[in-house]
């Protein structure tokens, strides 16, 4: 078998084997090694070099295999945008934010720009569980039976109603959606003159 | 208008190790991409490429020569240095050191040359 | 290696002349050549790059083309200061090689 070319090597179809880690040079008709994750272009490549990379400074990154002679600036999560940090910028990756507690991301293009409060879900409902937080607004859904939500909150849960029994009491009104069950003491036993079978 | 300038011992004896330096002043050796090259002239005029260096460490040589050489670049003195070991009298020539554009491989700025004669 | 050839090895030509050198490649180099004129006791001078690209600072009488193995350096109208020797350079594939140069000098 052929031995694989190392870059830079000529390429007549202005494809690479390697589409990750190697780039198309069209000046000089070859394929050059990208710099990996964390690193830029020092020193471009030629017939003869391959390309030199070198680390990006502090409070920069580049994330991907790239051709870039920069790395890009590390940016704040805007707090005035709703955003927060949960893993600092590194060499290899951006800061990364989210939405703060009690909000959503409002506008995204590639990542979240702008955070907004969620939506208060009334009485009676509840925000349907997301696969990730701050994703997007509250969509409200009904308690299910034999729950209730008393308040309109952003993030309030549906509680099951309560069971008057359990706690040696009985039920005085039952339970709603937006309403738990209301329960008093069991009343005072019949009188006798009440007591079994009454006849028509 | 960058310039470069070598300096070193005119000559050396066989079997020792020809120490060449090129000073580069009008710009920095570790800026824009540049690679810095030794090129030698024999006395029969011929042009012989030696190799090429990047600050970063990077080193390219002519296989030819590639057991015997070693290029460096040292960023604190912005200096190019040559080592050749084992030299002989086809050793003797004038050496120069040259600038290597970004992504080519012409030299487009030399330094005025340095001659090392092989002789005991 | 890639072995570089140029003809003739000296030329005699006068003031004012026309005058063309070649440099031909043992393989083919697409149009990575590259001429270099020297004067006695200097350095070598970058006059084109890639068979045709004319260096910063180098007077318009001097000119490159070709491409593949033929390449050629055109002077075209010699002055004084043109009686030098003359170098092709070929930037195609590793080891970099140069050819065995050209003399011009004046008739």
């Known amino acids: 078998s052929q031995p694989q070319a190392v870059p830079p090597y000529a390429s007549e179809n202005q494809t690479c084997r390697d589409q990750e880690k190697e780039y198309y040079e069209p000046q000089h008709r070859i394929c050059c090694s990208r710099c990996p994750p964390g690193t830029y272009v020092s020193a471009k490549c030629s017939r003869i070099r391959d390309t030199v990379c070198a680390t990006c400074a502090e409070n920069s990154y580049n994330e991907h295999w790239n051709y870039l002679t920069i790395c890009q600036l590390c940016r704040p999560c805007d707090p005035v945008m709703g955003l927060e940090e949960i893993a600092p910028c590194t060499s290899k990756r951006k800061t990364q934010c989210r939405c703060q507690p009690g909000m959503f991301c409002a506008a995204w293009a590639l990542e979240c720009t702008h955070c907004e409060l969620l939506s208060d879900c009334p009485p009676g409902t509840e925000a349907e569980l997301k696969d990730e937080v701050g994703k997007g607004n509250n969509h409200c859904v009904p308690c299910k039976a034999g729950h209730f939500q008393n308040t309109s909150s952003p993030s309030a849960r549906c509680q099951p109603h309560t069971r008057c029994e359990n706690q040696g009491l009985v039920e005085a009104a039952p339970g709603t959606a937006q309403s738990d069950t209301t329960c008093k003491n069991p009343l005072e036993p019949l009188p006798p003159e009440m007591s079994g079978t009454m006849l028509m | 208008q960058v310039q470069l300038q070598e300096s070193g011992p005119g000559r050396v004896k066989p079997s020792q190790t020809l120490s060449l330096t090129c000073t580069v002043s009008g710009g920095s050796i570790n800026s824009g991409g540049y690679f810095w090259s030794w090129i030698r002239q024999h006395p029969g005029k011929v042009l012989e490429w030696i190799g090429y260096?990047?600050?970063?460490?990077?080193?390219y040589y002519n296989p030819s020569l590639k057991s015997r050489v070693t290029i460096s670049v040292d960023t604190s003195k912005n200096q190019l240095s040559l080592k050749l070991n084992s030299v002989n009298a086809a050793d003797t020539a004038v050496y120069y050191c040259?600038?290597?554009?970004?992504?080519?491989?012409?030299?487009?700025?030399w330094g005025q040359g340095a001659l090392v004669t092989v002789s005991s | 290696d890639l072995q570089l050839t140029q003809s003739p090895s000296s030329l005699s030509a006068s003031v004012g002349d026309r005058v063309t050198i070649t440099c031909r490649a043992s393989?083919?180099?697409?149009?990575?050549l590259n001429w270099y004129q020297q004067k006695p006791g200097k350095a070598p001078k970058l006059l084109i790059y890639d068979a045709s690209s004319l260096q910063s600072g180098v007077p318009s009488r001097f000119s490159g083309s070709g491409s593949g193995t033929d390449f050629t350096l055109t002077i075209s109208s010699l002055q004084p200061e043109d009686f030098e020797t003359y170098y092709c350079q070929q930037s195609f594939s590793a080891p970099i090689t140069f050819g065995q140069g050209t003399r011009l000098e004046i008739k």
């Open positions: 260096s990047h600050y970063s460490g990077t080193t």
């Open positions: 040259a600038r290597v554009p970004d992504g080519e491989d012409y030299f487009d700025y």
């Open positions: 393989q083919t180099i697409s149009s990575y």
